[in-house]
């Protein structure tokens, strides 16, 4: 908090109940509960600041549109140039029509050699997906059992080498109260004994540490 | 007054290049497709080269195709031919040439003066 | 190409002679004819646009005429001024081609 104070110092107290008299007082009571905090902002401040906000995004949406427009329009410019025929004839135009037949068999050229270039990357990777579903399908998946773990075997599964390291370190801290624990420790591993016992749990902890 | 003047004429050996230049004046420049044609020792004419008006398509006869590139700069209102690998029988005087238009027929509707280019050994 | 070729390299006429020049195609040209004037001096004009319309300022004694192949200009009432070399040029396919011209002398 960066004055300091603490979360009730700043809570209003919850006004007194309004004297039943009127049905006002009953409406009052039930729309707006008095323990509730009230808030600083009108609802028509409320209406005008949504309506603020809708209009900022509204305006943000179209300038996005806008801005979408103007990058194709900039795009098109410059792959499609404005026809100029001030002062072409019926014989420039045909030789245009040509230049812009040639241009389009070119471009229809590139693009087959694109699609076919596609097609053979999309035949590539079906084929190496493929290989994956085979290879995935000669390892056998053991099947899992649910077992329980301790923290310590966690560690020691999931960091291998480095989780041993820890759990020296852990050991050598724990070491200290060893002695004076060492009474207590026996009752209660008695008393677990049983309670594993008498829940099953003794034959699944031997065969999860064998 | 429409006016056009061509400048860059010269003597040259074969195989040598040679930029022609053309100013125009008297009228709105960038509307209008321009063109240069040659007049031969012979006094044969022969069309050179069109640029459209905003220099985007050009046309040339086979004859000079891939050596000669003709060009424009709207801003300077100035009409260029450049001349590559030229040859004897490009020797000739150029001409500078608005062109027009109407229903499809198109046509040089003014000249300049002529810049005369010599290419001999 | 479409080849251009006029029936005459010269023409002898007086001043006052009505005077026609030809010019076929190789080929259908559908109207697309034009026709310069060149001076002595080496200037060019354009005279006939569209096989018979006249370009603006050129005198209304000039003419064309013709469809298809064949194509002819006319020019009544030869002046002194009208003693020069003619072109015809057809606008129908690329390469935009001209034929030789005919030098028009006075008698």
């Known amino acids: 908090m960066a004055d300091g104070s603490s979360d009730a110092a700043r809570e209003p107290r919850p006004a007194p109940a309004p004297i039943r008299r009127r049905s006002s007082n009953y409406r009052a009571y039930a729309t707006e509960p008095h323990a509730k905090k009230k808030s600083k902002i009108s609802a028509s401040r409320k209406l005008q600041l949504k309506t603020l906000l809708l209009q900022i995004a509204k305006q943000e949406l179209e300038r996005e549109a806008e801005e979408r427009r103007g990058e194709k329009g900039r795009a098109l410019s410059t792959r499609c140039q404005p026809l100029e025929l001030a002062g072409l004839g019926f014989a420039e135009l045909q030789d245009l029509c040509r230049q812009l037949h040639a241009r389009v068999d070119k471009v229809d050229e590139e693009r087959y050699d694109i699609e076919a270039k596609v097609t053979k990357n999309i035949t590539e990777i079906a084929d190496l997906t493929q290989k994956i579903f085979d290879l995935r399908g000669k390892f056998k998946r053991p099947t899992l059992r649910r077992v329980r773990i301790s923290a310590d075997a966690m560690m020691q599964a999931l960091l291998g080498a480095r989780a041993k390291e820890s759990l020296d370190l852990r050991a050598h801290l724990k070491q200290v109260k060893k002695e004076d624990t060492e009474k207590e420790n026996r009752e209660v591993g008695d008393w677990r004994k049983n309670i594993d016992a008498l829940s099953g749990m003794e034959g699944r902890k031997k065969k999860f540490e064998s | 007054e429409v006016q056009m003047v061509e400048s860059g004429g010269g003597l040259l050996k074969p195989g040598g290049s040679l930029k022609l230049s053309c100013a125009a004046s008297?009228?709105?420049?960038?509307?209008?497709?321009m063109s240069w044609v040659r007049q031969t020792p012979e006094k044969r004419l022969e069309w050179v080269a069109t640029?459209?008006?905003?220099?985007?398509?050009?046309y040339y006869p086979d004859s000079v195709k891939g050596r000669f590139t003709i060009s424009r700069d709207n801003a300077k209102n100035t009409l260029y031919l450049q001349m590559l690998s030229l040859r004897s029988e490009d020797t000739a005087m150029y001409y500078c040439?608005?062109?027009?238009?109407?229903?499809?027929?198109?046509?040089?509707?003014?000249w300049g003066q002529g810049s005369s280019v010599t290419v001999s050994s | 190409d479409i080849q251009m070729t006029q029936t005459s390299s010269s023409l002898s006429a007086s001043l006052g002679d009505r005077v026609t020049i030809s010019c076929r195609a190789s080929?259908?040209?559908?109207?697309?004819l034009n026709w310069y004037q060149q001076k002595p001096d080496g200037t060019i004009k354009l005279l006939i646009y569209?096989?018979?319309r006249i370009h603006s300022g050129v005198s209304s004694r000039f003419s064309g005429s013709g469809s298809g192949t064949d194509y002819s200009l006319t020019i009544s009432n030869l002046e002194q001024e009208d003693i020069a070399t003619y072109f015809c040029?057809?606008?129908?396919?690329?390469?935009?081609t001209f034929d030789t011209g005919t030098k028009l002398e006075l008698k």
């Open positions: 040439a608005r062109r027009d238009n109407y229903y499809g027929s198109s046509f040089m509707d003014y």
């Open positions: 008297g009228f709105t420049y960038s509307n209008y497709a």
């Open positions: 640029i459209s008006s905003g220099g985007s398509y050009s």
């Open positions: 080929q259908d040209i559908t109207n697309y």
């Open positions: 569209y096989t018979s």
């Open positions: 040029q057809q606008g129908n396919t690329i390469p935009l």
